[in-house]
C-alpha cells in the first residue's frame, strides 16, 4: 500500500529484562500476521530531568500507531512517556513535544518544552 | 484454529502436589509465553507467572516463590504447571494463557480452565 | 506490585445501555493495559489490549480508552450477551496484577 511504511524490525531494550526473561538490548524482528500491522515502540521515564528508557521494541496492531513515521509522545508530562511509529528502526530516536491545550489566547506567548532525543 | 486444551479436574488432599498441563495446537508453540493465572471460587483473577517455551525459562509471582515449578515439553508443545504443599486456599480453577512475545503482551487466548479441590 | 483498582465492582443495566467501567493503576503503566470479559463457568476472553485496541472478532460496541493510571471500558449498547464479570490488567511490570472485576448484572 502506497505511503504505508511497513514495520520488519525494531530496535529492542528492557531494563526489567533480568525478571522479564528477555534479552536486555538488541533488534527484535515482528513477525506477524498478513492482515495485522506492526510497529515499533519506546517507553520511558524523565527522572529529575534524566531519561530513563524502560522498553522498547516491536508494538501489535494499534490504530494509534498508524502511519507514524517518527516515534512522539504527545501527551503533557505523563508518568511514563510512550511513543509507537511504523518503519524499520523507528524507534531509534523517540521525541516528547507535548500538544498544547488550545485555551483562550493570552498576553504572554506559550513557549512549547523542549523535546527529548535518544 | 488456536487452542489450548488442559487437563481434567484433581481433587487433592493438603500437603500434596497438583501438575496441570495445557497442550497447544494450531500455532507456533515456541513463538508465544504460557502464562498461568487462578481464580479461587467467587474470586477474581491472580497470576501465577509464566515460561517461555523456546528456552525453558520461567519467572513465577512471589507469593508462589519455591511452590510453583512451570516445565514444556516442545515435542508435544504441551506447558505444565506444578504446585506443592498444596493447602486448601489453593482450591481454585487454574488457566494457562498464550502472550504475544511483543508489547503489550495481552493473554489472547485460554484454556478452559482446570479445577483443582484441596480437602482432607 | 502495581495495583489495579476497578469500580464499581458491579452495576445493574439494561439492554441497549451504555455502561462504563474504570480501572485505577497504583503507578504509572501507559498503555499497557488490557480487558477481559468472563462468563461464569467459562474462561476469559480478551477484548482490549494496549488500552484501546479491539481484538480481532470482538463487537465494535466495545471500546476502551485512556493511558497512565486512568482507563475505561465502554459498552455503547448493551446486548444480552454481555452481562458478564470484566476484569482489567496490567502488563507493564511483573508481577502482572488484574483490578477486582466488575458484575454487569440484569436490571
Known amino acids: 500500500i502506497l505511503g504505508r511504511s511497513e514495520t520488519q524490525e525494531c530496535l529492542f531494550f528492557n531494563a526489567n529484562w533480568e525478571k522479564d526473561r528477555t534479552n536486555q538490548t538488541g533488534v527484535e524482528p515482528c513477525y506477524g500476521d498478513k492482515d495485522k500491522r506492526r510497529h515499533c515502540f519506546a517507553t520511558w521515564k524523565n527522572i529529575s530531568g534524566s531519561i530513563e528508557i524502560v522498553k522498547q521494541g516491536c508494538w501489535l496492531d494499534d490504530i494509534n500507531c498508524y502511519d507514524r513515521t517518527d516515534c512522539v509522545e504527545k501527551k503533557d508530562s505523563p508518568e511514563v512517556y510512550f511513543c509507537c511509529c511504523e518503519g524499520n528502526m523507528c524507534n531509534e530516536k523517540f521525541s516528547y513535544f507535548p500538544e498544547m491545550e488550545v485555551t483562550q489566547p493570552t498576553s504572554n506567548p506559550v513557549t512549547p518544552k523542549p523535546p527529548y532525543y535518544n | 484454529q488456536v487452542q489450548l486444551v488442559q487437563s481434567g479436574a484433581e481433587v487433592k488432599k493438603p500437603g500434596a502436589s497438583v501438575k496441570v498441563s495445557c497442550k497447544a495446537s494450531?500455532?507456533?508453540?515456541?513463538?508465544?509465553?504460557m502464562h498461568w493465572v487462578r481464580q479461587a471460587p467467587g474470586q477474581g483473577l491472580e497470576w501465577m507467572g509464566f515460561i517461555v517455551p523456546s528456552g525453558g525459562s520461567t519467572s513465577y509471582a512471589q507469593k508462589f516463590q519455591g511452590r510453583v515449578t512451570m516445565t514444556r515439553d516442545t515435542s508435544t508443545s504441551t506447558v505444565y504447571m506444578e504446585l506443592s504443599s498444596l493447602r486448601s486456599e489453593d482450591t481454585a480453577v487454574y488457566y494457562c494463557?498464550?502472550?504475544?512475545?511483543?508489547?503489550?503482551?495481552?493473554?489472547?487466548?485460554w484454556g478452559q480452565g482446570t479445577t483443582v479441590t484441596v480437602s482432607s | 506490585d502495581i495495583q489495579m483498582t476497578q469500580s464499581p465492582s458491579s452495576v445493574s443495566a439494561s439492554v441497549g445501555d451504555r455502561v462504563t467501567i474504570t480501572c485505577r493503576a497504583s503507578?504509572?503503566?501507559?498503555?499497557?493495559l488490557a480487558w477481559y470479559q468472563q462468563k461464569p463457568g467459562k474462561a476469559p476472553k480478551l477484548l482490549i489490549y494496549?488500552?484501546?485496541s479491539l481484538q480481532s472478532g470482538v463487537p465494535s460496541r466495545f471500546s476502551g480508552s485512556g493511558s497512565g493510571t486512568d482507563f475505561t471500558l465502554t459498552i455503547s449498547s448493551l446486548q444480552p450477551e454481555d452481562f458478564a464479570t470484566y476484569y482489567c490488567q496490567q502488563a507493564f511490570s511483573h508481577p502482572w496484577t488484574f483490578g477486582g472485576g466488575t458484575k454487569v448484572e440484569i436490571k
Open positions: 494496549a488500552a484501546s
Open positions: 494450531g500455532y507456533t508453540f515456541t513463538s508465544y509465553r
Open positions: 494463557a498464550r502472550v504475544s512475545m511483543y508489547a503489550p503482551e495481552p493473554m489472547d487466548v
Open positions: 503507578q504509572g503503566i501507559s498503555r499497557w
